[in-house]
């Protein structure tokens, strides 16, 4: 299996951004996905029979979806860095993908939405 | 709040299959929680053996898989454990527990008082 | 399976003192760790969710913290009723697994 990711994104301060990762090559179920930053706090996980989980810190800025995805809200500058997904599946076992985010100051933020094999 | 008690024979052969109930009180089954089977061998260790969701599928613990069914019944507030094949080692504590997973993950916020089995020929 | 190692079996202190009680991770678990307080005869009580907080009615002398695969829970000042056993337990991914329990006993 294989994890594609929207890789490098860039997105404006106190704007929004859609963290997305997809899972192919595998006929493996997907149990879980985690969502995670890159000093190991946990931002949400999606269990396939119980649902989204929402870490606390941040329920007032993080929106379920898309699909297994994740939109983060009103972004700041400690925003920037790299976010996790990792795929529990059976039988396969985890997969984990990668995705940097910078948030920028300027008001002309490109935000790219290709997908690439990070 | 939501109350949760289990029942059951205390007294089960080896080689035949424990069977047991939790009663939901104050909560409908088929809302947004989690239904849970925990245990607590003699030494104090846990085990969580699986859950029940509110949409009736199950996960369970893949060290029980093979023996192992959680069901319900949504007109009595109940869901079940049925273990088979029991041995000795299957003499424990069980517990029902319920948890709110969008809210607190897999973090069992309200227990049942808990039922003794003892698998003993 | 992810085993979750709590090192003292058992923790002795006296009434006021601040209590430290480790809980380690076998791999990386993110900040998805309860607390639980088991008292002789009772079924196990959540304390603290998602590493650091307290659940409802929960006295704010228990804290919890840490990440990855450290974590600690500690009581501030500690009080006789919080003579009890207490666990850790991990949700990152099932199966969900407890640690092994730390005895509190009041000197």
């Known amino acids: 299996g294989t994890i594609e990711t929207t890789g490098n994104i860039s997105a404006k301060k106190g704007g929004s951004v859609i963290l997305q990762c997809h899972l192919s090559s595998t006929m493996a179920q997907v149990t879980q996905v985690n969502w995670e930053q890159h000093d190991h706090s946990l931002l949400a996980i999606r269990n396939a029979e119980l649902g989204w989980h929402i870490y606390p810190a941040f329920k007032d800025r993080v929106a379920p979806g898309p699909g297994l995805g994740l939109t983060l809200q009103s972004l700041t500058m400690n925003d920037t860095g790299e976010y996790f997904c990792t795929y529990h599946t059976y039988p396969d076992g985890t997969y984990r993908g990668r995705i940097f985010l910078e948030v920028l100051e300027s008001s002309v933020a490109e935000h790219s939405a290709r997908f690439q094999i990070p | 709040d939501v109350q949760l008690q289990e029942s059951g024979p205390g007294l089960v052969k080896p080689s035949q299959s424990l069977s047991l109930t939790c009663t939901v009180t104050g909560y409908s089954i088929t809302s947004d929680y989690a239904w849970n089977w925990i245990r607590q061998f003699p030494g104090n260790k846990l085990e969580w053996m699986g859950y029940?969701?509110?949409?009736?599928?199950?996960s369970y613990n893949p060290s029980l898989k093979s023996r192992i069914s959680i069901t319900r019944d949504t007109s009595k507030n109940q869901f079940f454990l049925q273990l088979n094949s029991v041995t000795t080692e299957d003499t424990a504590t069980y517990y029902c527990a319920t948890l709110i997973y969008y809210d607190y993950g897999g973090a069992m916020n309200f227990w049942g008082q808990g039922t003794s089995v003892t698998v003993s020929s | 399976d992810i085993v979750m190692t709590q090192s003292h079996k058992f923790m002795s202190t006296s009434v006021g003192d601040r209590v430290s009680i480790t809980c380690k991770a076998s791999q990386g678990v993110s900040t998805t760790v309860a607390w639980y307080q088991q008292k002789p005869g009772q079924s196990p009580k959540l304390l603290i969710y998602s590493a650091s907080y307290r659940y409802t009615g929960v006295p704010d002398r228990f804290t919890g913290s840490g990440s990855g695969t450290d974590f600690t829970f500690t009581i501030s000042s500690v009080q006789s009723e919080d003579l009890a056993v207490y666990y850790c337990q991990h949700y990152y991914s099932t199966p969900w697994t407890f640690g092994g329990g730390t005895k509190l006993e009041i000197k």
């Open positions: 029940i969701s509110n949409s009736g599928s199950a």
